[in-house]
């Protein structure tokens, strides 16, 4: 008789999840000399221990603490790039500007990027059929709690000028319900962070509006100012040209506004 299994509203664990995490860990440690000593089997064991045999709607940040400790990594605190709803461009940017880091450029972020996972209460099985959806099922699911935990730690580590890339094509350029809006903004440390600089990325070719005047950006400025952190904002009218100028800053066309 097949055992009854909880059906969740979200997609199940990414296929070959354990192998993917382990392979990503090995690859990361080979590429980043400062992390070359990391024992990826221990990292996977800690990752697995955070959600296996636990109810996937009852995961806590404490469940991830062993993994957080094993994945401790020092990134230059003044070279942090946050992003919201514009991950691909943020990652393209840090691939060119190698001294800046998104969360997904760290070991733990790299391990989990674009993956889904969950277990089942009281069994050692990984659930490949379905996992809880943040809205329809529960917010304390393994994936959401993981990203909340690593995002909080990443924001807490930031110092000096912190940059954030925001998507100017969305109705809410700054969304209080995004990970950036609900976690990272509130965990920047005013005693360490001097300025949050927002880069608003324009979508349309002919879009010459000053999106830094958008009401949601003003809302972000208000939140940040109340936390005793300065705020600045720049329009990136041409993201393609922006990336090109990061690659080739000497290019004569890069002196004009991008």
């Amino acid at each position: 008789v097949p055992r009854w299994r909880q059906q969740w509203s979200g997609p199940g664990t990414t296929k070959r999840f354990p192998e993917t995490v382990l392979a990503r860990c090995v690859k990361y440690t080979e590429i980043h000399p400062e992390m070359r000593h990391v024992d990826c089997q221990s990292v996977w064991d800690a990752f697995k221990g955070a959600f296996i045999s636990k109810h996937p709607c009852n995961i806590t940040e404490e469940d991830y603490q062993p993994l957080m400790k094993l994945g401790t990594q020092t990134v230059p605190c003044n070279k942090i790039l946050l992003w919201s709803r514009i991950k691909d461009l943020a990652h393209q940017f840090t691939q060119v500007q190698r001294d800046m880091f998104t969360l997904e450029d760290t070991l733990l972020g790299y391990l989990a990027d674009d993956l889904t996972w969950c277990g089942e209460f009281n069994t050692s099985k990984i659930n490949y059929q379905s996992c809880p959806d943040w809205r329809k099922d529960c917010s304390n699911n393994p994936v959401s709690v993981f990203w909340k935990t690593v995002s909080r730690r990443f924001a807490e580590a930031a110092c000096d000028v912190v940059h954030v890339m925001l998507n100017g094509s969305r109705s809410k350029i700054f969304d209080k319900n995004s990970t950036f809006g609900s976690v990272e903004v509130h965990n920047l440390q005013p005693e360490k962070v001097q300025t949050l600089e927002a880069w608003v990325i324009h979508g349309g070719r002919e879009d010459s509006r000053d999106l830094c005047q958008d009401p949601t950006i003003k809302e972000l400025e208000s939140i940040i100012s109340k936390r005793n952190i300065q705020f600045s904002c720049k329009n990136i009218y041409r993201p393609d040209k922006f990336l090109q100028c990061v690659k080739n800053p000497e290019d004569s066309s890069c002196t004009s506004e991008i």
């Epitope: 000399p33 000593h37 024992d39 221990s42 990292v43 400790k69 994945g71 401790t72």
Partner: antibody, heavy 117, light 110 residues
Framework: QVQLQQWGAGLLKPSETLSLTCAVY????????WSWIRQPPGKGLEWIGE???????NYNPSLKSRVTISVDTSKNQFSLKLSSVTAADTAVYYC???????????WGQGTMVTVSS | QSVVTQPPSVSAAPGQKVTISCSGS????????VSWYQHLPGTAPKLLIY???NRPSGIPDRFSGSKSGTSATLGITGLQTGDEANYYC???????????FGGGTKLTVL
């Protein structure tokens, strides 16, 4: 067969600078980290610091203010300088290669360095 | 005082088995690979175990390594008088950005 050959002054006075060099023979120099490790008489092994072929270094925090490790890729050599030595720096000093398997797989023969007035 | 601790000494009779422990924390053994070395007086240390439990070629299978959490163990079976030496564990420490050695364990074959 990779071999490490090391040399340098064996007797120093307090406040002088210890200087040792390690040459890599019979194998690749790039792609590895190269360490200095010491063992004071009757004590255990102590890691001093490391360097790779591009000159990137890490040092033992307790020695960092006095240590400089440098590299000469044209000669496949790396060197240790330890300034302001005292009797506590008396030890056998080893150079070693950190292999691809997160361990010291090849060691130099060791150099006894004595600090005495 | 080493951040990674080993018993100062262990002893056993020829043919017996002995284990040497190495205890650390999350920032060293917990998250990084452990290696083991045999050090005979007047010679350079010799690698016995790398990546927690692997032997380099030429090291007999009497020597084994394991790791669990923040501790590692070196096992030696079929003890021989030639095994008398000092044994060291080593691992990277993420917090220190450097290697750390255990204090060393003197093995006496009775």
């Amino acid at each position: 067969q990779v071999q490490l050959q090391q040399w340098g002054a064996g007797l120093l006075k307090p406040s002088e600078t210890l200087s040792l060099t390690c040459a890599v023979y019979g194998g690749s120099f790039s792609g590895y980290y190269w360490s200095w490790i010491r063992q004071p008489p009757g004590k255990g092994l102590e890691w001093i610091g490391e360097i790779n072929h591009s000159g990137s270094t890490n040092y033992n925090p307790s020695l960092k203010s006095r240590v400089t490790i440098s590299v000469d890729t044209s000669k496949n050599q790396f060197s240790l300088k330890l300034s302001s030595v005292t009797a506590a720096d008396t030890a056998v000093y080893y150079c070693a290669r950190e292999g691809l398997r997160h361990s010291f797989d090849i060691w130099g023969q060791g150099t006894m360095v004595t600090v005495s007035s | 005082q080493s951040v990674v601790t080993q018993p100062p000494s262990v002893s056993a009779a020829p043919g017996q088995k002995v284990t040497i422990s190495c205890s650390g924390s999350n920032s060293n053994i917990g998250s990084n690979y452990v290696s083991w070395y045999q050090h005979l007086p007047g010679t350079a240390p010799k690698l016995l175990i790398y990546d927690n439990n692997n032997r380099p070629s030429g090291i007999p299978d009497r020597f084994s390594g394991s790791k669990s959490g923040t501790s590692a163990t070196l096992g030696i079976t079929g003890l021989q008088t030639g095994d008398e030496a000092n044994y060291y564990c080593a691992t990277w420490d993420t917090s220190l950005s450097g290697w750390v050695f255990g204090g060393g364990t003197k093995l006496t074959v009775l």
